[in-house]
């Protein structure tokens, strides 16, 4: 059975994202990218204050990261 | 198929200038990051650019750093790689590859490169 | 710039053998960490990105573990298509970095 990433835990990103709704915050870089090709409103944290997501799902996997996270296939974007 | 056919390596002088190229088929090219990694003979990889899907960014490796320049042409689902002010530590085969991203809540995080082309050689020589 | 150092160099191994490769990172990367096979004349195929997990199509033998600063990349079996040269990668941070591989080599 395929496993998931590990906990990506450590990177320094600031937490909610710093960026404009239409961008995305890009953990490679430290900056803030457009998200423009993604169409899709920003996730709502469920409950939490602080919704930055600090573990990655499979890249095949679609939405449905957990309490309110996210995790979508983004096709390169960058 | 997803596919990275390259072209544009050959033999050039020291100080002389090339360009190489990277086709890009089988995917949405205007909707991914692309890199160049060069590897020198017996040598370990070295990753010299990256250009945003819409060229908005660039990154580049402190050896090629104001001699090369990475840019792309959507509408011909292309890559480029313009280098300038050849040196023969510039010999090397470079490759053209994918950025490989996910979207994790409102963070983009990276997974490497994971389509790669077939590589061109670039001899610098005198 | 961020440095990874894989041990061994190079290895010889049998059909069959588990084999074991390590990156050892100059700080920590938390789990930003692919490993690549690369043959000769041919481009680098990614095999485990985010230190741990299966690129697609990837066969099961290849497993990879580790965070922080210290990765470990396995083939619990080698296969004949496995003697080829492993290449970690992090990606971290801007610049891209590369270990210098570990040539797998056949007994």
């Known amino acids: 059975m395929r496993r998931g990433p590990r906990s990506l835990r450590g990177r320094d990103a600031p937490a909610p994202t710093p960026c404009v709704p239409a961008e995305c915050f890009d953990l490679l870089v430290r900056h803030c990218v457009a998200c423009g090709l993604l169409r899709t409103p920003r996730p709502k944290p469920a409950g939490a204050s602080s919704p930055a997501p600090r573990t990655a799902l499979q890249p095949q996997e679609s939405v449905g990261a957990g309490a309110g996270e996210a995790a979508l296939p983004l096709p390169g974007l960058l | 198929e997803v596919q990275l056919v390259q072209s544009g390596g050959g033999v050039v002088q020291p100080g002389r200038s090339l360009r190489l190229s990277c086709a890009a088929s089988?995917?949405?090219?205007?909707?991914?990051?692309m890199h160049w990694v060069r590897q020198a003979p017996g040598k370990c990889l070295e990753w010299v650019a990256v250009i945003w899907y819409d060229a908005s960014n660039k990154y580049y490796g402190d050896s090629v750093k104001g001699r090369f320049t990475i840019s792309r042409d959507n509408s011909k689902n292309t890559l480029y790689l313009q280098m300038n002010s050849l040196r023969d530590e510039d010999t090397a085969v470079y490759y053209c590859?994918?950025?490989?991203?996910?979207?994790?809540?409102?963070?983009?995080?990276?997974?490497?490169?994971?389509?790669w082309g077939q590589g061109t050689t670039v001899t610098v020589s005198s | 710039e961020i440095v990874l150092t894989q041990s061994p160099s190079s290895l010889s191994a049998s059909v069959g053998d588990r084999v074991t490769i390590t990156c050892r990172a100059s700080?920590?990367?938390?789990?930003?960490l692919n490993w690549y096979q690369q043959k000769p004349g041919k481009a680098p195929k990614l095999l485990i990105y985010?230190?741990?997990s299966l690129q697609s199509g990837v066969p099961s033998r290849f497993s990879g573990s580790g965070s922080g600063t210290d990765f470990t990349l396995t083939i619990s079996s080698l296969q004949p298509e496995d003697f080829a040269t492993y290449y970690c990668?992090?990606?971290?941070?801007?610049?891209?970095?590369f270990g210098c591989g570990t040539k797998v080599e056949i007994k």
């Open positions: 990668q992090q990606s971290y941070s801007i610049p891209l970095t």
């Open positions: 700080q920590s990367i938390s789990s930003y």
């Open positions: 985010a230190a741990s």
């Open positions: 590859a994918r950025r490989f991203t996910r979207l994790r809540g409102w963070y983009i995080e990276d997974y490497g490169l994971d389509v």
């Open positions: 089988g995917f949405t090219f205007s909707m991914y990051g």
